[in-house]
């Protein structure tokens, strides 16, 4: 048995007569033989679930669900209740109604076995019938909504009449009907005004019924019509077996460059017309098991269950359903030497499904793990300016397909043939497994005999120690020009274009900082700033070279404080800034301020 609503509302007035009927509560059956029996909780509750008093005023007819006043609620009784309401004005009280034989403790009131009945209290006597508006004669202030379980026997779930009105204003005629389309499973009995289902409902056909209740009031010669929504929600049960959309039960996958733990290798989708079990229970009740195969496969793969609610069209309306994605995921990083082909089977079980048929599916994954060989081009040719500053990025080296790699740890090293001309360094970028070449020793760069630099690039897979090699030829171009006096270590210090471009700074490939002119659109990613190279800084990402020294690109790498209009980067730097952003790396501070148009002369004059 279950209640068709979780809450009911009615009005209570001072000195309302004992015997006044208040409202009906309704229970629906889960099985045809069930007979409802209602009982009231012992206590009345007030604001914030405060237990006010034992309920001495309201009774229920156990078989019909009719609540009525057992004795009049007078002023003194109401005062007594109000005193216990933690100092709040007592505007509403509620009772708990339980369905026997459900033996719920009084403290808990959860649908489906318990409903709350709220009474709005009016510190006056019942108003004169002639003063009541049609809306007050027809419907409670709070609009009801109903919940009906699918596949359950039909039954009565609502009674339209406002019983106190009918009891105290017998001369006012009130008639009700339901506006509904053809063939809907609801009926309003003209005599009893009870609303019932005609047949068992199927949620997978229709989940929500937005009906309209029409009330016609006849008082003497006048007739008025009031209409309110009458929504019914159909509650789901696990009556649909899982299926494969379009019959696809097999997925094939190749594991090659993406070999990182947690990589999704393949996905198979399962459709279930149900939305139960609910999300909290779903993973426990909707199980997936990777069937035992060889030990290697069991250690290498796991299956992840990703359920998602979707909506499907049924009979012209949309109903919710569930799609379950089963992802075959790498459980560990795979060595580049690994080379296998296998078939994996996954058993999916909708354990709540009662039939007919089975709630079990078998998913198949065909997986090929291919080995990866390391290749570098035979030769790299690059040029570098003699004016380049330390940490200037001058190029990249990358084993074949390195951009596509994940879970493959390749380290790059440079071996110099000229001992005194070891100018460059290389660091491996975790993002794309490439090696970033940068200037490491500017003194060597300036030596006349270091006009051509010869290196061997060696790429090594850390797990297998497999290697690839290439020649690197670097031409040193231009002549060295000493820096202006007073130039900062970091390009980011400069706040104006003029002072930016006349200086170099750490990370500058040309020996000169570059000014990036922003778009001036409020707090923007494209803020004005001075950079060693606008190709790499700022780009919203503190790369592996920039991490070597905070002076290279504090705009991307600073962990300190940013003053002024900005949006902080994740996890560091400036994601967006207002106007011009300049930084003092040694002080771990950046400032984003409106564009500074003043003439440099003003500084000294106005100081």
């Amino acid at each position: 048995l279950y209640f068709s609503r979780d809450a009911y509302w009615e009005k209570l007035y001072v000195d309302q007569a004992a015997g006044t009927p208040l409202l009906y509560v309704h229970a629906l059956r889960d099985a045809p033989e069930e007979v409802p029996s209602f009982r009231l909780g012992q206590h009345l509750y007030g604001t914030y679930r405060t237990r006010l008093h034992e309920n001495n005023w309201i009774c229920i007819q156990e078989d019909t669900g009719l609540l009525y006043l057992n004795r009049s609620l007078d002023h003194s009784s109401w005062e007594k209740l109000s005193v216990r309401n933690r100092g709040f004005p007592l505007l509403t009280v509620y009772l708990k109604v339980f369905l026997s034989p459900t033996s719920l403790r009084e403290g808990e009131c959860q649908w489906p076995g318990c409903a709350r009945v709220y009474f709005s209290f009016f510190n006056t006597s019942f108003p004169a019938c002639s003063s009541l508006k049609p809306r007050e004669l027809c419907f409670p202030e709070t609009r009801p909504s109903f919940r009906i379980r699918e596949n359950r026997p039909p039954g009565t779930f609502h009674q339209f009449r406002l019983l106190p009105v009918q009891f105290l204003c017998p001369n006012i005629s009130v008639a009700y009907r339901l506006l509904e389309g053809e063939g809907l499973p609801f009926r309003c009995a003209p005599d009893s005004l009870e609303v019932s289902t005609r047949w068992a409902l199927d949620r997978e056909q229709r989940e929500k019924y937005e009906l309209v209740a029409v009330c016609t009031v006849h008082a003497g010669a006048r007739e008025e019509v009031v209409m309110v929504p009458f929504p019914v929600t159909v509650y789901d049960e696990d009556d649909s077996a899982p299926t494969f959309p379009a019959g696809v039960d097999t997925a094939s996958a190749v594991v090659e460059f993406k070999r990182k733990e947690d990589t999704v290798v393949a996905t198979l989708r399962v459709f279930d017309a149900d939305v139960v079990p609910a999300s909290g229970e779903l993973v426990r009740r909707y199980t997936s098991t990777l069937l035992p195969g060889d030990t290697w496969a069991q250690q290498t793969f796991r299956v992840e269950h990703w359920p998602n609610e979707t909506s499907v069209q049924a009979n012209g309306s949309f109903v919710r359903a569930t799609v379950h994605d089963y992802r075959l995921v790498l459980n560990r990083n795979l060595s580049i030497s690994e080379n296998r082909t296998m078939q994996l089977a996954v058993l999916v079980n909708d354990s709540d499904f009662q039939g007919p048929g089975a709630g079990v599916l078998l998913l198949h994954f065909n997986v090929s793990v291919l080995p990866v060989s390391l290749h570098l081009p035979s030769t790299y040719s690059l040029s570098v300016s003699r004016r380049a500053r330390r940490f200037a990025q001058i190029g990249k080296v990358c084993v074949e397909n390195c951009q596509a790699f994940s879970g493959i740890n390749v380290q790059y090293k440079l071996h110099s043939s000229g001992a005194n001309c070891s100018t460059l360094g290389v660091v491996t970028s975790a993002e794309d497994t490439s090696g970033i070449l940068f200037v490491n020793d500017t003194k060597a760069l300036r030596r006349p005999k270091c006009a051509e630099l010869h290196y061997m690039v060696v790429a090594t897979d850390q797990q297998t120690s497999r290697q690839a090699q290439a020649q690197l030829l670097v031409t040193v171009e231009g002549s060295y020009v000493a820096e202006e006096a007073g130039c900062p270590l970091s390009c980011a210090v400069s706040k104006r274009r003029l002072e930016c471009e006349e200086c170099g700074g750490l990370g500058s490939p040309t020996g000169r900082c570059e000014w990036r002119q922003g778009d001036g659109k409020g707090i923007t990613r494209n803020f004005s700033t001075c950079s060693p190279s606008t190709k790499t800084c700022p780009d919203g990402h503190c790369d592996v070279v920039e991490t070597q020294d905070i002076n290279i690109c504090p705009q991307d790498c600073l962990r300190g404080s940013i003053v002024g209009g900005h949006e902080p980067g994740e996890p560091r730097g400036i994601k967006a800034g207002y106007g011009t952003c300049n930084c003092f790396p040694e002080e771990e501070k950046c400032f984003c301020e409106p564009e500074d148009i003043q003439d440099p002369l003003c500084d000294e004059l106005c100081r």
Epitope: G486, C487, P488, L489, V493, D549, E586, E587, E588, E604
Partner: antibody, heavy 123, light 107 residues
Amino acid sequence: QVQLQQSGPGLVKPSQTLSLTCAISGDSVSSNSVAWNWIRQSPSRGLEWLGRTYYRSNWYNTYAVSVKSRITIDPDTSKNQFSLQLNSVTPEDTALYYCARGHRYSGSYFDYWGQGTLVTVSS
Amino acid sequence: DIQMTQSPSSLSASVGDRVTITCRASQNINSYFNWYQQKPGKAPKLLIYAASSLQSGVPSRFSGGGSGTDFTLTISSLQPEDFATYYCQQTYTIPWTFGQGTKVEIK
């Protein structure tokens, strides 16, 4: 040849203000490429950098957190000097105080120092 | 703040000895690192800046090495005027901090 000449009282009462001046010759307090620093030395704390002032389009000051709420370093372009003010002193501030020139942009090394002023905080 | 730890805190050596003093930073400071010499009653004097660059006028027997967190000052052949206290300093982030000093005494 750059020279830094310090001046100021050697005795200050607790809760009063310590004031020292550093006069520069052979360089300019407004020079773009350097910063002008105050450093102190005591047996308990060793060498402790206090703060600096420097000019680059605008004047900037940077102070050590340990004294930030009490310290002011001011340049005086007309006299080509800079000063230190340390408010609300306690006996803990007793030390040998130095001014020094810092090369702002090559990693801030201190290549010229004043002769030092021993300041005692005592009533 | 970045802590600078010097070792040893003092050492005894003879004229002509090769002496090495080490300094460790509590975090990576690249080469933003200097060495100073201080004699009693005098201000500190810059010896080495940027970890390994010799300040002009400083004898070539002084040399600096290291990068990151570990640094050394080496005096290849100790002279009588080298008996003094030596301080290391980081200038990577403010506040600039110094080591506690290493006193080089005559054996």
